[in-house]
Interface confidence: medium
């Protein structure tokens, strides 16, 4: 057993060396080790094949060190590894895309607080067993296409506290089992209408504290299991383009955050969900650092990520709401409620923890994938109940005289709910 470490065999063969001031991975780690705890040291480099002899290793904690470099082959031979915690290594900044290749049994990967600026192509390739991926509190600016494509068993993806400015079409492709997606505290101004296409099992979506002024209803349509959505702390523009989002929220019966309006000024601070339909009139004209939203440009969107308010044909001018004009029976807002049956109610009153699935199931060390969280996953906190079906939001065809509220690349539909503890 290395000098700074404590080694023991029960309940698992363990080499434990936390907070010992180690500057390198110690030599002489017993080959039979199933758990290695090296957190809280001063290790700056993980050389290739550092743990190659430890074929039975299932848990490796390297968090809270000063890692600046991890060789691409650092974890070679660790075919049984289930938990890898590299979090809180702010100098790391980048990880070679081959670093995690071969870790076919990995179910929990912590890369939070690592100063990561980008996710290299293929970084998570082959991690078919991964269920929990922690990427929060980094410096990520973009979500490259197909980054998570192989993660078909991923249930929790933490991306909050980064610098992500948009959610492109293929960002979350392949995440068919995802239950929880945390994107709050980023700089998201635009969500592609098809960004959430594969997320049919998503129950929790956090988008609060971003730069969203609108959200395409089409993006929310695939979220059939959605229960919790937080949209607060965004610069929502509550004009005619917010109608689909408003309508969706009226139907949604889960638990949702407030959606406070930023514009127009007369509605600033008010919750979109609590507005009346005729409050959402015309097109707000932004002032100050924002660009005017009502323009004749040919693009589908304004710089804020809002759909453009369309200029009608001359004959249809009377059917378009201009700022300040009251809604009338013949205006372009008529019929804007997305079709679809109302979702079933979830009952009134608070849900009680001890009656919930996670509140009663034991946290077994080797549970079935579908039942209980595996060892190394995040705690249930206040657990969620079983999935409730949500209606898909389809869109009606719209004539040229209508604002293209629900079309691809435009509009502002939203959904949902959130519960946070």
């Amino acid at each position: 057993c290395p000098g700074a470490c404590v080694c023991y065999n029960e309940p698992k063969v363990t080499t434990s060396c936390p907070q010992q001031g180690l500057q390198a991975v110690p030599v002489g780690i017993p080959a039979a080790s199933q758990r290695i705890f090296l957190h809280g040291n001063r290790i700056s480099h993980v050389p290739a094949a550092s743990f190659r002899a430890c074929r039975n290793l299932t848990i490796l904690w390297l968090h809270s060190n000063v890692l600046a470099r991890i060789d691409a082959a650092a974890f070679t031979g660790l075919a049984l590894l289930e938990q890898l915690d590299l979090s809180d290594n702010a100098q790391l900044r980048s990880v070679d895309p081959a670093t995690f290749h071969g870790l076919g049994r990995l179910h929990t990967l912590h890369l939070d607080r690592c100063g990561l600026q980008e996710l290299g192509p293929g970084l998570f390739r082959g991690l078919a067993a991964l269920q929990y991926l922690y990427l929060q509190d980094n410096a990520l600016q973009a979500l490259p296409d197909d980054t998570f494509r192989d993660l078909g068993n991923l249930t929790h993806l933490f991306l909050h506290g980064n610098r992500i400015s948009s959610v492109p079409e293929r960002a979350f492709r392949g995440l068919h089992s995802l239950d929880r997606l945390l994107l709050h505290q980023n700089r998201v101004a635009h969500v592609h209408p098809h960004a959430f296409r594969d997320l049919g099992r998503l129950m929790t979506l956090y988008l609060f504290a971003n730069n969203l002024s609108a959200l395409p209803t089409e993006a929310l349509a695939p979220l059939r299991a959605l229960q919790y959505l937080r949209l607060n702390d965004n610069p929502w523009v509550c004009d005619c383009r917010a109608r689909p989002l408003w309508a969706w929220l009226q139907k949604f019966r889960g638990s949702s955050s407030e959606v406070p309006c930023s514009l127009p000024q007369r509605l600033a601070g008010r919750d979109l969900k609590r507005l009346a339909a005729n409050d959402l009139q015309g097109c707000a004209v932004a002032t100050g650092p924002y660009h005017p939203i009502w323009t004749g440009r040919a693009t589908d969107e304004e710089p804020l990520g809002l759909p453009k308010c369309c200029q009608p044909d001359a004959a249809d001018k009377a059917s378009v709401l201009e700022p300040g004009r009251p809604a009338s029976a013949g205006n372009a807002l008529k019929g804007r409620v997305p079709p679809g049956d109302s979702p079933p109610g979830n009952g009134s009153g608070p849900r009680h923890i001890n009656d919930s699935p996670f509140g009663t199931l034991p946290g077994s060390a080797e549970p079935p994938l579908t039942a209980v969280r595996p060892e190394g996953s995040e705690p249930p906190g206040f657990p969620t109940s079983g999935p409730r079906r949500r209606p898909g939001c389809s869109r009606k065809n719209r004539t040229r005289s209508h604002c293209r509220l629900g079309q691809a690349g435009s509009g502002g539909g939203g959904t949902g709910d959130s519960e946070g503890s």
Epitope: S257, T360, P362, G376, G381, E419, S421
Partner: antibody, heavy 124, light 107 residues
Framework: QMQLVQSGGGLEQPGRSLRLSCVTS????????MHWVRQAPGKGLEWVSG????????GYADSVKGRFTVSRDNSKNSLYLQMNSLRAEDTAVYYC?????????????????WGQGTLVTVSS | DIQMTQSPSSVSASVGDRVTITCRAS??????LSWYQQKPGKAPKLLIY???NLQSGVPLRFSGSGSGTDFTLTINSLQPEDSATYYC?????????FGQGTKVEIK
Amino acid sequence: QMQLVQSGGGLEQPGRSLRLSCVTSGFNFNDYAMHWVRQAPGKGLEWVSGISWNSGAIGYADSVKGRFTVSRDNSKNSLYLQMNSLRAEDTAVYYCARDYNYETSGYYHGFDNWGQGTLVTVSS
Amino acid sequence: DIQMTQSPSSVSASVGDRVTITCRASQGISRWLSWYQQKPGKAPKLLIYAASNLQSGVPLRFSGSGSGTDFTLTINSLQPEDSATYYCQQTNNFPYTFGQGTKVEIK
């Protein structure tokens, strides 16, 4: 700085009621679950109850279920514990605590801030 | 409910000694265990969260490890101000439960 200020404790007879309050400041109360933990004289800590940020989930220890009710008012940054049908064994110092958990951090942090505690004595 | 069993119930050690407190859960709780320090008449103070993560401001002589059912809190070089009662708490399943406490005294 962060503060959790408790009130409402005191002496009460068995079978009667008391309401504890915990007023917070220095953080965004809306974003956190909150808990009540108690400690009987000379004994250890016992988790009593917890409530999620939006009151959508609520939990109780078996020993208080059906008698105690936890609630919160986010507009007042306040947490409450309504204690009915008090028993002698409810005598304890009651603490409110903030739960800095994964719903906002993505990573569990335990009960990172606590109130000063308020003594509840149940005696005839 | 998940039972948490701490051992020893009390320990007396000298300044500079290494003190180890163990906590065993009655069923697997993954990493979801916190450690608290409480001094007489004061509210508990969070030391370690998620089994091994040191809470901000806590001295480096405190460390935690373990996963599943067996957990350890280690005080590497005991200081006079470490005289207190230490509690583990599982946060894996509701209701959350605490261990019965370990009283650490300075010889």
